[in-house]
């Protein structure tokens, strides 16, 4: 059998190497960069995806690192340390021993320090606000149709339970999607809102992480919804700890 016939690939993560060397010759996939085994029936964690992205050849990366002064690093382009479950380690450091604390979506939440910096726990991002601007259309989308389509998208494409899509707001051309998921609400097996938001972000940018599943085909009553700008805001269960100097910059 050829590889194409066996089709040993990871539908939910193209940044993997797969081979039929699992139990009973079953397809087993490992994330690039970390070599960790991934569950291809659900989303891969953002930490493993970022690590895989950084391990790819530099010319394969199409996005530019945000400026050092960016308040929110939406792309999070650094080579993260992930724990054995694939989550971000609370403390991240670079090769020059500069360290900082991150939240559960890997976004920096403290000033940068040295190796003595302590990050006692991984603080959960429990509220994500995805702010979109869609391209001009003949008329505004019907709000309830738009709401239903986006909830469907998060449930069917990203496997996120509808209860975690708190609200969809719309004032043409701005769409806001609120995702909420407290530590107490997230059960084992639930997709994390941070992972769903990251997959959505990459889909919107035309950089789908799905293998062979095609790009995002987002339609409201048959009318294509094309996004021209995305901003993502993260709120943590514990407020971030930046110095006043950073806050007034």
């Amino acid at each position: 059998h050829t590889a194409a016939q066996d089709n040993c690939t990871c539908p939910t993560n193209k940044m993997t190497v797969c081979s039929p060397d699992g139990p009973g010759g079953r397809c087993q996939c490992r994330a690039l960069g970390s070599g960790m085994a991934v569950d291809c029936s659900t989303l891969t964690s953002k930490c493993l995806l970022l690590k895989a992205r950084m391990s790819a050849p530099k010319n394969a990366r199409t996005l530019v690192r945000p400026s050092e002064h960016a308040l929110v690093d939406n792309d999070g382009l650094y080579d993260p340390d992930c724990d054995p479950e694939g989550r971000f380690k609370a403390r991240q450091c670079n090769q020059t021993s500069v360290c900082w604390c991150v939240n559960s979506v890997g976004v920096r939440r403290t000033d940068k320090g040295d190796l003595s910096l302590r990050c006692d726990e991984l603080v959960r991002t429990h509220h994500i606000l995805i702010d979109l601007r869609h391209r001009p259309t003949a008329g505004a989308f019907n709000h309830s149709d738009l709401d239903a389509e986006l909830r469907r998208l998060f449930r069917e494409r990203y496997r996120l339970h509808p209860k975690f899509v708190a609200a969809v707001h719309y004032e043409q051309p701005t769409i806001q999607i609120e995702l909420r998921q407290n530590t107490s609400q997230k059960a084992a097996g639930d997709v994390d809102i941070g992972d769903a938001a990251y997959y959505f972000e990459r889909d919107i940018k035309g950089e789908s992480l799905f293998q062979g599943r095609g790009g995002l085909d987002l339609r409201v009553r048959g009318e294509p919804l094309q996004v021209e700008r995305t901003l993502i805001y993260y709120l943590d269960e514990i407020p971030p700890k930046f110095s006043m100097k950073r806050l007034t910059a």
Epitope: P11, E156, R157, H161, G189, R213, G214, L216, D217, G222
Partner: antibody, heavy 116, light 108 residues
Framework: QVQLQESGPGLVKPSGTLSLTCAVS?????????WSWVRQPPGKGLEWIGE???????DYNPSLKSRVIISVDKSKNQFSLKVRSVTAADTAVYYC?????????WGQGTLVTVSS | EIVLTQFPGTLSLSPGERATLSCRSS???????LAWYQQKPGQAPRLLIS???SRATGIPDRFSGSGSGTDFTLTISRLEPEDFAVYYC?????????FGQGTKVEIK
Amino acid sequence: QVQLQESGPGLVKPSGTLSLTCAVSGGSISSSNWWSWVRQPPGKGLEWIGEIYHDGSTDYNPSLKSRVIISVDKSKNQFSLKVRSVTAADTAVYYCARDNWGFDYWGQGTLVTVSS
Amino acid sequence: EIVLTQFPGTLSLSPGERATLSCRSSQSVSSSYLAWYQQKPGQAPRLLISGASSRATGIPDRFSGSGSGTDFTLTISRLEPEDFAVYYCQQYGSSPRTFGQGTKVEIK
């Protein structure tokens, strides 16, 4: 490898209640998937009955909603189907399936006949 | 409810031939939410294609899916003896999930 196995009586009397259970092995029911019931009358096509998430959230086919209850037992890694007030039209092969970008895993199906 | 109509109802072909099966939806379905299944007598359906074009694990590359909006196609490039079966399309983009009535691919 996820495996699903339906079990329950093969014969139910008219106006009675059809009860089936689907045991999930090789994977946890507490995953990001929904778990479905689908039926197929003899010689006919497939009809989706409804589905459940591990937290007990359900979604039913409106054509059957008034007669159907789907429940989950996480401790036993199984989910169940009850259809009340059955008639001969409910005679079918009943399948349980995992809903994960389409129904990617199915039980082998169990024939339930409604007859007195 | 989205109604899916499959045609032809029966397709009579010989092994080695190309099979083209169609599925039409009563309203627009995002291509992300369309699947195809194969069912043989006495067996459960088997997922072939999801997201209109993505082959499921273990499905041979002679099976391919395409389409968008209201028209979708399943193509079997060269029929093997084991491919003679009933094929169903299904949409999972809105509730209730619905199936087409099926296309039977039989040996000519």
